[in-house]
Amino acid sequence: EDWQCPRTPYAASRDFDVKYVVPSFSAGGLVQAMVTYEGDRNESAVFVAIRNRLHVLGPDLKSVQSLATGPAGDPGCQTCAACGPGPHGPPGDTDTKVLVLDPALPALVSCGSSLQGRCFLHDLEPQGTAVHLAAPACLFSAHHNRPDDCPDCVASPLGTRVTVVEQGQASYFYVASSLDAAVAASFSPRSVSIRRLKADASGFAPGFVALSVLPKHLVSYSIEYVHSFHTGAFVYFLTVQPASVTDDPSALHTRLARLSATEPELGDYRELVLDCRFAPKRRRRGAPEGGQPYPVLRVAHSAPVGAQLATELSIAEGQEVLFGVFVTGKDGGPGVGPNSVVCAFPIDLLDTLIDEGVERCCESPVHPGLRRGLDFFQSPSFCPNPPGLEALSPNTSCRHFPLLVSSSFSRVDLFNGLLGPVQVTALYVTRLDNVTVAHMGTMDGRILQVELVRSLNYLLYVSNFSLGDSGQPVQRDVSRLGDHLLFASGDQVFQVPIQGPGCRHFLTCGRCLRAWHFMGCGWCGNMCGQQKECPGSWQQDHCPPKLTEFHPHSGPLRGSTRLTLCGSNFYLHPSGLVPEGTHQVTVGQSPCRPLPKDSSKLRPVPRKDFVEEFECELEPLGTQAVGPTNVSLTVTNMPPGKHFRVDGTSVLRGFSFMEPVLIAVQPLFGPRAGGTCLTLEGQSLSVGTSRAVLVNGTECLLARVSEGQLLCATPPGATVASVPLSLQVGGAQVPGSWTFQYRED
């Protein structure tokens, strides 16, 4: 019989229900925005905005200062007071729409839904390792702003993204706002604009450059700005918007908008469609050819990548990559594939595609039918013509006008659909050693820290834990402070170590010591932990073998048994070759001699499952007693593996030595031709791994084996005669003298 060790699911080596408590702060209301500051002199702060209030926290998440930002018209509103005596507009709550740092000053800028979306500038005042906010400056000049032209109206109640860029001595605010007809009619915010902060902090310079959704499209064409960032020579906005101005407005797709970070102008404003798909390895019948589209971006983050992912993406280590979490639609409801997919877009490739698109539009002769696009911002036109014009005048350049690149940038899910039902709501990517880690928040209030790799059919978790008991969604915006990430969920801010919250979710020594170096995991006798959790017994260099099962569970006291041991950390080498003298197995007092691994039986084990097998030949000593005993595996002097060496002993109870007894055999005669069905009755007849019924030295073919009974078919006899019949278990004869009589057929 060929017994095989049962597979242990990979998931059995970890427990994602382990509770981790990370530092947190209760903000007293739904967190609307959050940003962190790290100064040159070790001072740092976390700024957390809720409705009508702005909290300043120290690096330990303890409250340092709190500022009332609303309601507008309320005498207690501290920011409103900075604008002088009112009224400044209709009263109402202030929901923070923008919270950014101006690194040049340094200062914090907050903009809310009240007071025409104006902003306030708070200079940062370091006090030891903490930071305080100076009295706010109102970034609004009443005489400069009109309902139809308002350089100081920044935030839209429908959402605004801001990236601040230093150019020379000035700070430029790259602003993208969602609009509708009602918002557009009220102090005219723009869709995309670049505004220079005035040196006297009295607001933004007039005459700023801007693009806005044309009035005729405002009702049906809404743009959601999901993320903005600055890298290299450009500022990028990521949007979700209708795929067409003319078609169904609910058919959405994702675009990247690129603006120059060195020139505060919009002539070189470019857009590119980002296409993220789930392409399963085995395509279902009826599934779309290029994979299932996930057109709607939920969250995004850009970061330099580690060596392994860089190789997989065919780029250089440390190059900036834009990562996006995409869903199938606005509701992100379940489709055929996973709920969320993650696509990676190398920034250099994005830039190349955009630049190629510009060349295609502006070359001579131009490909016929190429459109400039962006018909929601500008009059329709064909390349190379400027918007709304039939031809290019000699002194204007085709390049100096906004353009939608005609080709899209297509990528497939990095996780191959393995996020499954998880709905990702927050994303931050970091590079740790040469590993790229995605830190993801989920709809049900969990944090997933997963290595970003393409080539696997399982997820490599750093951690997967619940932030708290509320189960509220983790919010989109994540901030970094030192070696921690700050996630918001409901009314709380949580501080999660980039290296993971701990190691207790790794249940086995092998899984523990295979964890990434940056996690700092070590084995503490019977649990995985960081050194500070168990300084006494903590070590990172070896694991004992672990016996989980063996077969058979009993063997004869006389005769040999082929014993198969199951478990982990037997070899550390896929070949399973055992150096001489390293593995010692004892069953009770008896040694079990290691058997060479049968290479024909070697089966590839998928990484999702793991099990190791070890076989040995058990020959009980003469002193061995009948009855239950332990199986013990000791491994010593093993050469070290990639992560650790195997060293130690594992003991498992449950083996029994038994003495088979043969009580009766019937019938005691049969035809010389053979084929008589013999029944042998007794006790412990099924022990061990081998047994044989011999009729005159020839094997009687076993048909059934049980503890109390053996059935076999007699072989043909040479002559009519009485011949000896015997039973061997494990190669040793069971006591008793029996004969079988061959008769004429």
């Epitope: 190349t352 190629e356 060349e359 070359e363 001579s364 002769p365 490909h367 016929p368 000699p394 085709c398």
Partner: antibody
Framework: EVQLLESGGGLVQPGGSLRLSCAAS????????MGWVRQAPGKGLEWVSS????????YYADSVKGRFTISRDNSKNTLYLQMNSLRAEDTAVYYC?????????WGQGTLVTVSS | DIQMTQSPSSVSASVGDRVTITCRAS??????LAWYQQKPGKAPKLLIY???SLQSGVPSRFSGSGSGTDFTLTISSLQPEDFATYYC?????????FGQGTKVEIK
């Protein structure tokens, strides 16, 4: 009239260097991508290199990568091809041409002969 | 790299004949294809771009068709000045690659 005029070709020994120039006139040079295409005697056309309008991005054929450098001076309306470590198989007429996707117009070409 | 294969490598024809030259790309290039004419000792001249668009100043007897991987240049009625070598070139991606050329000779 749009015109391109190459110069700088000649006889050079293997391992030697040569710099080709292409003077452009009749159009706004700084608005266009430019490139070099070569043709070995009795053979077909082979694209060599292209450069963006600003000079900010360049492309090369594998056969010349690391040996040839394309550049431009928009103030002088001139395109250049610096050729180092020349080999016998680089012998060809080198044309400068305007364009990104397709090439139009072309210069009259300059002959580069690599021989010992 | 995208390989461009032209056929035939040469064709003998008379004035007034209809001549067809084909070009096959090793992978799809949409309509990013150009055709050039080159006469001995002269620089190439752009005839067709975007697979089927006639460059200004080129006689209408030249036409191009095709999309994806298979393209055709047709001269509807061969004129004496049309005896030359014709090249296709893909513009879908870098490196730009040319076909090996088709020589149109007098019969």
């Amino acid at each position: 009239e749009v015109q391109l005029l190459e110069s700088g070709g000649g006889l050079v020994q293997p391992g030697g260097s040569l710099r080709l120039s292409c003077a452009a006139s009749g159009f706004t040079f700084s608005n266009y991508m430019m490139g070099w295409v070569r043709q070995a005697p009795g053979k077909g056309l082979e694209w060599v290199s292209s450069i963006y309008f600003s000079g900010g991005k360049t492309y090369y054929a594998d056969s010349v990568k690391g040996r040839f450098t394309i550049s431009r001076d928009n103030s002088k309306n001139t395109l250049y091809l610096q050729m180092n470590s020349l080999r016998a198989e680089d012998t060809a007429v080198y044309y400068c041409a305007r364009g990104y996707s397709w090439f139009d117009p072309w210069g009259q070409g300059t002959l580069v002969t690599v021989s010992s | 790299d995208i390989q461009m294969t032209q056929s035939p490598s040469s064709v003998s024809a008379s004035v007034g004949d209809r001549v067809t030259i084909t070009c096959r790309a090793s992978q799809g290039i949409s309509s990013w294809l150009a055709w050039y004419q080159q006469k001995p000792g002269k620089a190439p001249k752009l005839l067709i771009y975007a697979a089927s668009s006639l460059q200004s100043g080129v006689p209408s007897r030249f036409s191009g068709s095709g999309s994806g991987t298979d393209f055709t240049l047709t001269i509807s009625s061969l004129q004496p000045e049309d005896f030359a070598t014709y090249y296709c070139q893909q513009a879908n991606s870098f490196p730009r690659t040319f076909g090996q050329g088709t020589k149109v000779e007098i019969k």
